[in-house]
């Protein structure tokens, strides 16, 4: 496939990655869906900045990232070190509440009011944000 | 109500060591990051170092960093920042600021407390 | 590191009258620009943060504008109270810096 070189249009270009943010909800399996239709996938926050920059763009609302614990460990959808990596908690989370009556406990994470995480039920129709890399072979044939 | 109060400060020669203290109340510690800022006398602010609310991330100026240490005790609501290798420029106004979870700004701020490096 | 360029440094001005603070990013940081005050002897106090977003008890006449990298607090109507010296700071990368601050004196 060939590179891209410049985002897609409605997607906003930061840092060498691209960014597309949803002003719909999906339950978190159909948001990491349509990402990946997209060429891309949920977002991974890897910094302080990217931390910042999303949360300038989404807002006080809830929003999917592409974090979930739903084989067992933490991890990022892009194969990003999840232990070693940047983490931004709300105090006390995550914590697999099983309170909430819906089954089963809390496994895709999602950024709150404030920008810091939470694990909430995946089922849960949030908006989302999608991320793809600039300079990575697209998906997409070369145009002859 | 929101306290914050620095101790720890006082005069030190060039090369040793200090450590500030900040006692905090009126809040949950435990939920909030935390700032240390430095003013040199007669000069503006100088952002010094941040940690999260448990410890989990730490970020330093550049002019401290490998020099000072921020860290918190969550069971005494107390924020530390250990400085070693102490320098002339270091002599400032030390305050801790407690951190604003959306926009990382210092929303609360101590008095301060004065550190000399001097011979 | 990201450089934070206040002006005026200083200032001699009347009660009453309108003030415009600047305060310039060396790259866009969005809208991650606060506002401080500070009294001599006294610890610094936020005023605005978020670029525009007064803090709960700060008088209307404080307002804040701007996002990217250039950004303004304007005081609307100088009190006796508002000499002082204020300082912007970004908080989008760290190392988190402050601008140099303005003076504000009485004229």
């Known amino acids: 496939g060939s590179e891209r070189t410049c985002c897609p249009v409605n997607w906003v270009e930061h840092e060498r990655s691209c960014y597309w943010f949803s002003r719909s909800g999906k339950a978190w399996a159909d948001a990491d869906n349509y990402c990946r239709l997209e060429d891309a996938h949920l977002v991974v926050v890897t910094s302080w900045e990217e931390q910042k920059f999303v949360q300038h763009h989404i807002g006080p609302v809830n929003t999917w990232m592409g974090l979930h614990d739903q084989n067992g460990p933490w991890k990022w959808v892009d194969g990003t070190d999840y232990e070693t990596g940047f983490k931004n908690w709300r105090p006390e989370q995550p914590d697999d509440w099983y309170g909430h009556g819906l089954g089963g406990g809390e496994d895709c994470a999602h950024f709150t009011d404030d920008g810091r995480w939470n694990d909430d039920v995946c089922q849960r129709p949030y908006r989302w944000v999608c991320e793809t890399e600039l300079d990575k072979a697209s998906q997409e044939p070369p145009l002859l | 109500q929101v306290q914050l109060v620095e101790s720890g400060g006082g005069v030190v020669q060039p090369g040793r060591s200090l450590r500030l203290s900040c006692a905090a109340s009126g809040f949950t510690f435990s939920s909030y990051g935390m700032h240390w800022v430095r003013q040199a006398p007669g000069k503006g602010l100088d952002w010094v170092a941040v940690i999260w609310y448990d410890g989990s991330n730490k970020y330093y100026a550049d002019s401290v960093k490998g020099r000072f240490t921020i860290s918190r005790d969550n069971s005494k609501n107390t924020l530390y920042l250990q400085m070693n290798s102490l320098r002339a420029e270091d002599t400032a106004v030390y305050y801790c600021?407690?951190?604003?979870?959306?926009?990382?700004?210092?929303?609360?701020w101590g008095q301060g407390t004065l550190v000399t490096v001097s011979s | 590191d990201i450089q934070m360029t206040q002006s005026p440094s200083s200032l001699s001005t009347s009660v009453g009258d309108r003030v415009t603070i600047t305060c310039r990013a060396s790259q866009s940081i969005f809208s991650y620009l606060h506002w401080y005050q500070q009294k001599p002897g006294k610890a610094p106090k936020l005023l605005i943060s978020a670029a525009s977003s007064l803090q709960s008890g700060v008088p209307s006449r404080f307002s804040g504008s701007g996002s990217g990298t250039d950004f303004t607090l304007t005081i609307s109507s100088l009190q006796p109270e508002d000499f002082a010296t204020f300082y912007c700071?970004?908080?989008?990368?760290?190392?988190?810096?402050f601008g140099g601050g303005t003076k504000v004196e009485i004229k």
């Open positions: 600021a407690r951190d604003d979870p959306r926009s990382s700004a210092g929303d609360y």
């Open positions: 700071q970004q908080t989008y990368s760290p190392p988190l810096t």
